[in-house]
């Protein structure tokens, strides 16, 4: 039950940090003004990884894409790479772990298919949510230096001219969302790996074991304090091995006039 | 690089009008502030005016009310309308774009129009 629980959560915290990533990755305010000590209020500018938009005092919103990549930082096609290879990956991972999810039956897939089936998209949640988290923090790196290469610069007077208007950009909306939808989709892998775990069958033969004989005979159960009869259906039909030993998954016991507490 | 071309300088009459335009390749962006410097023979380069945004605009208290800074982004284009010129704005026109794309600041220049006004 646990197992399950953990397996479910891990699915559900995964699916919103992916929708985190997509919707950060698609938002336009990556960068917006710093209104903090701005004397030009008339006209407010933000920038995304596809476009930059201009909204007006009167409260006209301009959007416009960067159809070039002449003039684009090399950054922000770094950027724009690790937060696509985030989504891609975290989609595999949640169309792989639909299908591994121990609520769902799918034909008569194997358990030990299923903890690997989970395992995988564990890892790829983890990638997916470390490549948003390194995408969103290389951006927030890239404003940092260059609004301190930029400082410097007028300071020392590489700037050329008196500028027009001074604008700096500070972080976003959509760097925040990006950091929190990474960390979910992190935690989300780490669970669905940690449900793995509990839905690896054991390979080792350490189960607790009923033993019979062929006769009407009391068998011991080891660890247990009541006493079974070695009857009972093999529901699972499986072969027996062992002389007659019984994992206490293999045996399913009826109550009897043979049992005693 | 952007690369910027200025255009439409010439000789006019006193009292008359000029647009001067300005090329941008490969593109403008939203966000890049436009603007037009001039520069006198003997006197320091001068604003004009600023263009941010598609609206909103400021001018030099000399030009007020003669000039208008407009820009077609279709085009990748900003104009200068001049009118009403006097004597005194003959000038070398230079078209300049502010970038500042993730707080890397770039500026660029045209090359320069030359503006004649005779009276």
């Known amino acids: 039950m646990a197992v399950t629980a953990c397996q479910g959560l891990g699915f559900v915290v995964s699916l919103i940090g992916i929708a985190g990533i997509i919707a950060a990755t698609c938002m336009d305010q990556w960068s917006t003004q710093d209104l903090y000590n701005n004397p030009v209020t008339a006209v407010f500018n933000y920038q995304g990884l596809w476009r930059s938009c201009v909204r007006e005092s009167s409260g006209f919103t301009e959007c416009r894409g960067y159809f070039t990549l002449l003039g684009l930082p090399a950054m922000l096609q770094a950027v724009r790479a690790l937060m696509i290879v985030g989504i891609v990956l975290g989609a595999i991972g949640l169309l792989v772990s639909i299908f591994a999810l121990k609520c769902i039956r799918i034909g008569s897939m194997e358990d030990s298919a299923k903890a690997n089936m989970t395992l995988t998209s564990g890892i790829m949640f983890i990638v997916s949510g470390l490549c948003a988290i390194a995408g969103v923090s290389v951006f927030a790196n890239m404003l940092v230096t260059n609004f301190w290469m930029s400082t410097a610069n007028m300071y020392t007077g590489m700037g050329g001219m008196v500028q027009t208007v001074q604008t700096r950009y500070t972080f976003g909306a959509a760097l925040f969302v990006g950091w929190v939808a990474g960390g979910l989709t992190l935690i989300g892998g780490v669970m669905m790996c940690i449900a793995c775990r509990g839905l690896a069958p054991e390979e080792t033969n350490y189960k607790a074991v009923s033993y019979h004989a062929s006769g009407h005979s009391v068998a011991y159960k080891p660890g247990g304090f009541k006493a079974s009869t070695g009857f009972g259906s093999n529901t699972k039909n499986k072969k027996i091995y062992d002389g007659g030993a019984r994992t206490e998954d293999e045996v399913q016991s009826y109550p009897s006039k043979h049992d005693y507490v | 690089a952007v690369q910027l071309v200025d255009s439409g300088g010439g000789l006019v009459q006193a009292g008359g009008s000029l647009r001067l335009s300005c090329a941008a390749s490969p593109t403008i962006f939203v966000t890049d502030v436009m603007a037009w410097y001039r520069q006198a023979p003997g006197n320091q380069r001068e604003l004009v005016a600023t263009?941010?945004?598609?609206?909103?605009?400021n001018y030099a208290d000399s030009v007020k009310g003669r000039f208008t800074i407009s820009r077609d982004n279709a085009k990748n284009t900003v104009y200068l309308q001049m009118n009403t010129l006097k004597p005194e704005d003959t000038a070398v026109y230079y078209c300049n774009l502010h970038r500042n794309l993730f707080n890397k600041i770039d500026n660029y220049w045209g090359q320069g129009t030359q503006v004649t006004v005779s009276s």
């Open positions: 263009l941010l945004g598609r609206s909103t605009t």
